[in-house]
Interface confidence: low
């Protein structure tokens, strides 16, 4: 059976696969997924290994018309470095010389300057080029190699291993060499995989059942450390509760060097955030941190300084802490908008069982704003999801130059932010450089400001506008209001009407359904339309909703189904990558973000059309 990293190298024109007959004869044969000799995999960014021989594809020289054969894998050799060129060409790195079969009656695979059909290769059974099954470095744990990556294949007791092994151990622990020759270098680490006993690499907090892994002997950059945690279905540490900080202070007390945690300000337009999307509501900075120096966007926990946090450049090499298991957040169910009949007094706006109102003109200090909201039967608004935030931005009449009090504050416990309405903190969205909590000005209250409505801490004594929120009164079945310019069941936003397609459909079926309704799969023109759509679908239980974006027409170029330019994108992390396909909006914790899916997957969808009676504004000229 093929493991997910292995593939057969297929030429569509010959309908044949590469076959390593022997180390000196790399030829082709009828494709057979059970043949070890046809299985290959990437073992570094640029090396391809034969699974059967545990040797790497290479050439004797970078010249035209030399045989491609198998060599002992050497990550430093220029003659074993391959790259995917445009589309499905595979070539030797840095040269216009390609992996080729079929010219001049040659049985062997050759390096050749021609870039025709006989130099084009795909992963057998897919339309993808070989790089789509690329190499993912595996960072080791413990051992003696400072968390270095596994070197595959590696030699142990004169035998080659292309995977982690428990060879030489009686306890089944999986390990790998971190250099090609373990026998000589004796460098190794344990693999970030599940195996009998791997649980003992973790420390479980008995109070919360959350597990922590302290990798104090490693030396990785922040991004590498994060990858290492993710390889274990975990994330870099987030700390949202004082108890959690206390537990970790104890766990790291015998250490001295800094350890990466998940806190970062890597997002271009927002502030401090945890990599696992936990809310940033508890602050434990070292005095003088966070320093505003550019580039210091990642955070370490300092065991030698009472486990306080310091921002550093992300390329520094440190140990790190991973976290997995039940989140420390209280479970807090946010009702889906569609589940809740929402009736609100005049001038209040309904959303997901609550009513909201912006008080822009009567400026008040935070304490008085809170009193006013409570007199009206509500509280300063709490915000629990990106959908709720996007509702406020897109449908409450929020303006880019607003600065409005919300209910978040750390008045009760310094450096521990809570909502004034007592609901748990499940979500935060700080502005870049926030929360700054400048000590010379006690900044205990929080405002929403700027075009995106992100948050900043502020001295509570400033007179500002504010947003109130209250529970809606349920009054029997909801009256479905027909919005002006839209048909029944459609929702209006600015110049357009939108409808959720409730039948699970492929991209093509969804597109056809929208067309039948004299509409089209939704386009998304800007941040505000995205905010509206996020609030429209984001709390629903289904995972995905099709948009009209795909690269069906031209692979690698994403276009809307209607002739409209792509002027705005909202990709999820690692998207669009190299995957061809159709684009759907996520719901849940990644609410609104765009993922590329296979076009024949089934999902719900959003249709869109011009509202009736709206004058079309002129198309922007580019």
């Amino acid at each position: 059976l093929l493991d997910t990293r292995q593939f057969l190298i297929y030429n569509e024109d010959h309908k044949r696969c590469v076959d390593a007959v022997s180390p000196s004869a790399v030829q082709t044969a009828a494709c057979n997924q059970d043949a070890e000799s046809q299985k290959f995999r990437w073992v570094s960014e640029s090396q391809i290994m034969s699974v059967a021989f545990k040797l790497c594809l290479g050439v004797p020289s970078k010249t035209d018309w030399v045989a491609i054969t198998l060599y002992a894998c050497d990550s430093k050799s220029e003659f074993q470095k391959w790259e995917c060129k445009n589309d499905t060409l595979l070539g030797i790195k840095g040269e216009d010389l390609f992996f080729n079969y079929g010219n001049r009656q040659e049985k062997n695979i050759m390096l050749y300057k021609g870039s025709g059909l006989w130099s084009r290769w795909k992963i057998y059974g897919t339309t993808d080029n070989l790089c789509s099954r690329g190499y993912e470095a595996m960072y080791t744990l413990l051992g003696n190699a400072n968390g270095a990556t596994c070197a595959f294949p590696f030699k142990f007791e004169n035998k080659w291993y292309a995977d982690c092994t428990s060879a030489g151990r009686s306890d089944g622990w999986l390990w790998c060499g971190t250099t090609t020759d373990y026998d000589t270098d004796k460098l190794f680490g344990y693999c970030p995989l599940k195996f009998e006993g791997s649980e003992s690499l973790w420390n479980k907090d008995p109070l919360t059942s959350v597990s922590y892994q302290i990798n104090s002997k490693s030396a990785l950059t922040w991004h590498q450390a994060r990858k290492s945690c993710q390889q274990q279905n975990a994330e870099l540490l987030s700390i949202t509760e004082i108890h959690e900080q206390t537990y970790l202070t104890g766990l790291t007390s015998s250490l001295t060097s800094g350890l990466w945690i998940g806190l970062n300000s890597l997002s271009f337009n927002s502030g401090w955030q945890w990599s696992d999307r936990s809310p940033f509501r508890y602050l434990n900075w070292l005095p003088g941190s966070p320093s505003a120096e550019p580039g210091k966007s990642c955070v370490s926990l300092n065991p030698g300084k009472n486990a306080k946090w310091e921002n550093l450049e992300c390329v520094q090499k440190l140990g790190y802490i991973c976290k997995k298991g039940n989140t420390t957040l209280n479970s807090f169910v946010i009702p889906s908008e569609s589940d809740v009949p929402t009736h609100c007094p005049s001038q209040w706006w309904p959303y997901a069982g609550h009513c909201y109102k912006i008080h822009r003109d009567e400026k008040k200090i935070q304490r008085d704003a809170l009193t006013t909201c409570r007199k009206e039967g509500g509280d300063l608004t709490s915000i629990h999801t990106i959908e709720e935030l996007d509702f406020i931005i897109s449908q409450l009449g929020y303006e880019p130059n607003d600065e409005l009090w919300i209910g978040l504050n750390d008045i009760k416990i310094q450096m521990y932010f809570e909502w004034s309405d007592g609901t748990p903190v499940t979500f935060t969205k700080w502005l870049r450089g926030e929360p700054s909590h400048e000590n010379n000005r006690q900044e205990d209250c929080v405002v929403m400001k700027g075009k995106d409505g992100y948050w900043a801490d502020r001295g509570c004594e400033w007179p500002l506008g504010y947003i109130c929120k209250m529970k809606s009164r349920s009054q029997g079945p909801e009256i479905v209001e027909v919005e002006k310019g839209c048909r029944k069941g459609w929702k209006k936003h600015h110049f357009y009407c939108y409808m959720i397609g409730h039948t699970l459909s492929t991209f093509a079926e969804a597109n056809q359904t929208c067309n039948n309704e004299n509409a089209y799969l939704t386009t998304i023109e800007d941040r505000y339309e995205q905010a509206f759509l996020t609030s429209f679908v984001g709390l629903r239980p289904e995972k995905y909703f099709w948009t009209g974006l795909s690269d069906i027409q031209t692979k690698g170029t994403f276009q809307w189904t209607i002739e409209e330019e792509v002027r705005f994108t909202h990709w999820n992390s690692d998207m669009p990558g190299r995957k061809p396909g159709c684009v759907a909006m996520r719901t849940g914790i990644a609410g609104g973000l765009w993922d590329v899916l296979k076009c024949d997957e089934k999902a719900k969808f959003v249709c869109k059309h011009w509202a009736e009676g709206v004058t079309h504004p002129p198309k922007p000229t580019t």
Partner: nanobody
Framework: DVQLVESGGGSVQPGGSLRLSCAAS????????KAWFRQAPGKEREEVAA???????NYADSVKGRFTISRDNAKNTVYLQMNSLKPEDTAVYYC?????????????WGQGTLVTVSS
């Protein structure tokens, strides 16, 4: 090299208690993962309880709530307190230590101590 010596085994009636000790010859015992295993006649060796170098503990479902693993770094010793013993706990109990920072294959076993539970 590390030597592990178990003690504390013996015969006991169902419902009784025993405390097993495992003393190590090496001073660096605290940087090892320690575990107690057992092997009943005709059965495979199974892990009963483990304590990590960080102090976390894990137990097999069959002994949860009855057995407690602990360690005393100053004495280079790990203990297994066994309460509410049952006949099915009868086995040879082995202590094991895994060094997690040297070569891939340095784990050490004791010789075993016999525990018999019968009326």
């Amino acid at each position: 090299d590390v030597q592990l010596v178990e003690s504390g085994g013996g015969s006991v009636q169902p419902g009784g208690s025993l405390r097993l000790s495992c003393a190590a010859s090496a001073r660096i015992f605290s940087s090892y993962h320690k575990a107690w295993f057992r092997q009943a006649p005709g059965k495979e060796r199974e892990e009963v309880a483990a304590i990590t170098s960080g102090g976390s503990t894990n137990y097999a479902d069959s002994v949860k709530g009855r057995f407690t693993i602990s360690r005393d770094n100053a004495k280079n010793t790990v203990y297994l307190q066994m309460n509410s013993l049952k006949p099915e706990d009868t086995a040879v109990y082995y202590c094991k230590a895994v060094v997690v920072t040297t070569t891939p294959y340095s784990d050490y076993w004791g010789q075993g101590t016999l525990v018999t539970v019968s009326s």
